[in-house]
């Protein structure tokens, strides 16, 4: 969390941003809040990005003002116009690109004063893994697949019964480049698995960590997976 204070002739206002990550090809949110004003027409929101000549987005007098917008962001940005009045300056970024990563500044002007805060935005690809029993294999084998990751993640297997065991000798992980030539499909195979055990396939890069669990018993198979973004901190 980053909290910034304005420094100007007017009073300063508090602006708060939260570092976040965007998933390439999907829509993302750059979070920013500020001390609200009672009049929408007095609020100016400017989003800037380090290294970019034009603005990312500008909202003033109750509407978008895009004459200074950089071509890199054309048609891809929007504020939540109905929430500006309550102090929400967050930006929706459509079709996140790898190159959208970097340092952004959320700059606010209201009748109370000015303020700004920086936000570190990371971009990459992350997806939920699915673990299945590979019935085509000659021995008891599990197959963990996740369709989109970038940068290349690490994959680690763990088991509930053999806690702390190193499965690197009995597993094989491959990365296959997807058609857009950036993200990769992750496939990891674990051999010699035993029944009545819960196995976890953990995929992690510097943006996200995802885990796929599978419990195999004689009568059923139970699966569970979850994904967590790393380094989300407020400013």
């Amino acid at each position: 969390l980053i909290i910034g204070f304005g420094i100007s002739g007017r009073h300063s206002i508090t602006v708060t941003t939260v570092a976040s990550a965007g998933n390439i090809g999907e829509d993302g949110i750059l979070s920013c809040t500020f001390e609200p004003d009672i009049k929408l027409s007095d609020i100016v929101i400017q989003w800037l990005k380090e290294g970019v000549l034009g603005l990312v987005h500008e909202f003033k007098e109750g509407k978008d003002e895009l004459s200074e917008q950089d071509e890199m962001f054309r048609g891809r940005t929007a504020v939540f116009a109905d929430q500006v009045i309550v102090g929400n300056a967050s930006l929706r970024l459509k079709n996140v690109q790898l190159t959208d990563a970097g340092t952004y500044k959320c700059y606010i002007i209201t009748s109370k004063g000015k303020g700004n805060a920086n936000l570190e935005y990371k971009t990459g690809a992350f997806s939920m893994p699915e673990v299945n029993v590979d019935y085509n294999a000659s021995s008891e084998t599990l197959r963990c697949e996740a369709p989109r990751w970038f940068p290349q993640p690490t994959v680690v297997w763990a088991s509930q019964v053999d806690q702390g065991a190193n499965f690197s000798e009995v597993s094989n992980t491959s990365f296959e480049l997807n058609s857009e030539n950036v993200t990769m499909k992750v496939v990891s195979v674990l051999y010699n698995v035993t029944i009545n055990n819960t196995y976890s396939c953990m995929i992690e890069n510097d943006i996200a960590k995802a885990t796929g669990d599978i419990k195999v018993t004689e009568s059923e198979i139970k699966r569970r997976s979850h994904l967590q973004l790393l380094n989300s901190k407020a400013s």
């Epitope: 290294g51 970019v52 000549l53 603005l55 200074e68 950089d70 790898l98």
Partner: antibody
């Protein structure tokens, strides 16, 4: 065809001033950020100024800050670089660029006594 | 400022060869890198932007790759018109900075 044509280069004494112009054609000038980049005689490249599409936001490296001013006239499709307090190390070929992809033909600036 | 270290500074190669030029940034630049070509006595032409995307009209024998702080430009099946100077440029942060250049010469 997208074109950028620079003019205004020449010889100037140290401490002198010069104003470069860049005429743009073949694209909607007012929707693009523009820059000036120079190439020194030893072929080194240095970005010297940038400006937002509408001209409200300008950016400079420390080496030229306070001495160079970038501006634009969107009605005339023209980019400018006003250079003052010129030094011998400002001698270079100056290029006008749209982003990093479209470059002009360049104009030569020589600062010498 | 972000320092862009480009290598090699020059290389002698033959027609039909495949060559790679690399640029290392002093910090992560998130693919905010472009590659430029300058022919002797001429201006610059953009070849690649955003690390991997080919500019309009650039032949597919040119390709870009990399992530984080390390990037490369590869030219496969070199043709006579490819002998020129090549530069990388980062736009992740102001000031934009350039590599020192690579001169491609005919062996």
């Amino acid at each position: 065809e997208v074109q950028l044509v620079e003019s205004g280069g020449g010889f100037v004494k140290p401490g002198g001033s010069l104003k470069l112009s860049c005429a743009a054609s073949g694209f909607t000038f007012s929707t693009f950020g523009m820059s000036w980049v120079r190439q020194t005689p030893d072929k080194r490249l240095e970005w010297v100024a940038g400006i937002s599409p509408g001209g409200s936001y300008t950016y400079y490296p420390d080496t030229v800050k306070g001495r160079f001013t970038i501006s634009r006239d969107n009605a005339r499709n023209t980019l400018y670089l006003q250079m003052s307090s010129l030094r011998s190390e400002d001698s270079a070929m100056y290029y006008c660029t749209r982003g990093r992809s479209v470059w002009g033909t360049g104009t030569t600036v020589t600062v010498s006594s | 400022d972000i320092l862009m270290t480009q290598s090699p500074s020059s290389m002698s190669v033959s027609l039909g060869d495949t060559v790679s030029i690399t640029c290392h940034a002093s910090q992560d630049i998130s693919s905010n890198i472009g590659w430029l070509q300058q022919k002797p006595g001429k201006s610059f032409k953009g070849l690649i932007y955003h690390g991997t995307t080919l500019e309009d009209g650039i032949p597919s024998r040119f390709s870009g790759s990399g992530s984080g702080a390390d990037y490369s430009l590869t030219i496969s099946s070199l043709e006579s018109e490819d002998f020129a100077d090549y530069y990388c440029v980062q736009s992740a942060q102001f000031p934009w900075t350039f590599g020192g250049g690579t001169k491609l010469e005919i062996k």
